[in-house]
Interface confidence: low
């Protein structure tokens, strides 16, 4: 069958279903493409004008391609194999109720299937495959392609080469020992430390200097890149990840369903649109949220903000601020604050900085 004779493929969303927010449609389609780019050398980019290789369309009934939709239920969507014109295009039946969750028809799951067709895959006889012809809802937080899906797509395009893993060619892996390196978010996860930057994270295991870089999407395919804040409650095996006004909960390294949720559920006022950094202190069972030049303190037991906040960072963390990029808690007494390429070891019992380091000092640079 036909395949795309190139690795950079564009897509365009022609119109939007009224069933979902536009951003949710964009997100579902982007994540669906990412499912396939994670296992192939293909890279997908969204364009808003002009001719795209793959056009995503919501339509009902007869819509000009001799393959009329059939109303609610039945055929949910269809797509055309690679080629010019209508080739590659994916059409979604507007008579379905499109959703981000298990109610109605999940757009992400359906899009993964249809994009499979857009890339040249036929149906699979394996009921576990996303290319199986029957729609089945599965938890999108733990969704992954079956071995059959991966075999199929890699027979057409090969596997992702080490230097081709990036869905976006100009967002290359940051140099770990660059003295100007800064991090978006840092948190412990058990005996490991996760350092987030763009679409990557580095993993530092206990005292070993060796570290490895990974794509966030390779561990958690449904999470976005550019995580801005993170904290761990180790006793609960929970990690909270923040981006913009949303947060995700990871339990035992698995994303929990029904996320992301709004950061405002923590009790932030509406003007807070994103979190810069967060850290949990198990001694006090409190989480500190850093937003611009202020911080809030959240009682994890009572699940509510402590009164008297926000406070100025500079007032209560001597030598830190006015803003920070990331922070984590370690060794029962230290916060490690990250500001640009600098890092400050802060003894919260003495309430002062005890060491100044480079942000990448953890990696033996």
């Amino acid at each position: 069958g036909p395949v795309w004779r190139k690795h950079y493929i564009t897509y365009r969303i022609n119109n939007y279903t009224p069933d979902m927010n536009r951003e949710d449609v964009d997100y579902a389609i982007r994540k669906a493409f990412q499912v396939w780019s994670n296992v192939t050398p293909l890279k997908f980019s969204k364009i808003n004008t002009g001719m795209a290789d793959i056009l995503v369309v919501f339509a009902r009934g007869a819509h000009g391609d001799f393959h009329a939709f059939d109303g609610k239920g039945g055929i949910l969507a269809h797509a055309f194999g690679p080629g010019s014109g209508i080739g590659g295009d994916a059409h979604f039946d507007e008579d379905e109720f499109w959703t981000t969750h298990s109610g109605g028809t999940n757009l992400f799951l359906t899009a993964v299937h249809e994009i499979g067709h857009s890339l040249g895959l036929g149906h699979s006889s394996d009921p576990k495959a996303v290319m199986f012809p029957t729609y089945k809802y599965v938890d999108i937080n733990t969704f992954r392609l079956s071995a059959d899906d991966i075999r199929g797509i890699q027979s057409l395009y090969g596997d992702p080469k080490e230097n081709q893993r990036l869905p976006n060619p100009d967002n290359s892996e940051p140099a770990l020992c660059d003295p100007n390196l800064s991090f978006d978010a840092v948190t412990t996860v058990g005996n490991k430390i996760f350092f987030f930057k763009d679409r990557f994270f580095w993993l530092k295991v206990s005292e070993r200097p060796k570290t490895s870089v990974n794509l966030i999407s390779s561990l958690w395919p449904t999470l976005p890149s550019g995580i801005e804040a993170a904290y761990e409650i180790e006793a609960r095996n929970q990690v909270f990840l923040f981006k913009d006004d949303k947060y995700w909960l990871i339990s035992n390294l698995r994303p929990e369903p029904n996320y992301p949720k709004s950061i405002h559920s923590f009790g932030f006022p509406n003007f807070v649109k994103k979190i810069d950094a967060a850290v949990f202190n198990p001694r006090f069972y409190r989480t500190y949220f850093f937003v611009d030049n202020q911080y809030w303190r959240y009682d994890e037991r009572r699940q509510m903000m402590d009164p008297g906040y926000p406070k100025l960072i500079t007032k209560n963390f001597q030598g830190i601020g006015p803003k920070i990029d990331a922070v984590f808690y370690s060794k029962n007494k230290y916060y490690y604050f990250f500001q640009g390429s600098n890092q400050f070891e802060y003894d919260f019992l003495l309430q002062r900085i005890t060491k100044t380091l480079k942000s990448n000092s953890w990696f033996g640079c």
């Epitope: 599965v138 079956s146 095996n237 339990s251």
Partner: antibody
């Protein structure tokens, strides 16, 4: 070997409370969803409640919502069911069950069950 | 809630007979169907999950089939230790629901 051992059942008056416990062993308790399933005398099985591995999310049957609370203590490998405002129709053997997730195309199933504990609600 | 209807509600068969139990669902549940066996006075045990996958240690004389709304549990050669009640259960959508059970006896 997976073992689930329920306790805490007994006779209670309507409107009363009971707390059931389920001690788990033979598997990594903190990694699995757990559930309570009940069976009224001579009747079929009825799912009561499930709890996620972390304890962060819970689900309940409509018949017990607002009256029963499922919880777990992963450090003690123990599952709990707090039952308040008990009614005669809650009389049943309550089973603790381990849930597993076969793969990403098939749902949860109860792969191991305890021996059950009898709860009798009667005046 | 998804309704589960098992048939027959009871059956009597001879040792080594082929026995078939059917489970119908009120809506399409794809392959989210499990089967359990409960010996008299004992706790239920998992037999089959995901329509046709045998649980660890379950005899190969048990098999499952079906898709959508109609499912079948087959015992290829009934043995005395198979007497008891068989339940189907869906995990397509919460609340998980069970069939009313099929009681199997030996003639």
């Amino acid at each position: 070997e997976v073992q689930l051992l329920e306790s805490g059942g007994g006779l209670v008056q309507p409107g009363g409370s009971l707390r059931l416990s389920c001690a788990a062993s033979g598997f990594t308790f903190s990694e699995y969803q757990m559930a309570w399933v009940r069976q009224a005398p001579g009747k079929g099985l009825e799912w009561v409640s499930s709890i996620y591995p972390s304890g962060g999310h819970t689900h309940y049957a409509d018949s017990v919502k607002g009256r029963f609370t499922i919880s777990r203590d992963n450090s003690k490998n123990t599952l709990y069911l707090q039952m308040n405002s008990l009614r005669a129709e809650d009389t049943a053997v309550y089973y603790c069950a381990k849930e597993s997730y076969y793969d990403f195309w098939s749902g949860y199933y109860f792969d191991y069950w305890g021996q059950g504990t009898l709860v009798t609600v009667s005046s | 809630d998804i309704q589960m209807t098992q048939s027959p509600s009871s059956l009597s068969a001879s040792v080594r007979d082929r026995v078939t139990i059917t489970c119908r669902t009120s809506q399409n549940i794809n392959t989210y169907l499990n089967w359990y066996y409960q010996a008299p006075g004992r706790a239920p045990k998992l037999l089959i999950f995901g329509v046709s996958s045998l649980h660890r240690g379950v005899s190969s004389r048990f098999s499952g089939s079906g898709d959508g709304t109609e499912f079948t549990l087959t015992i290829s050669s009934l043995q005395p230790e198979d007497i008891g009640t068989y339940f189907c259960q869906q995990s397509y959508s919460s609340p998980w629901t069970f069939g009313q059970g099929t009681k199997v006896e030996i003639k």
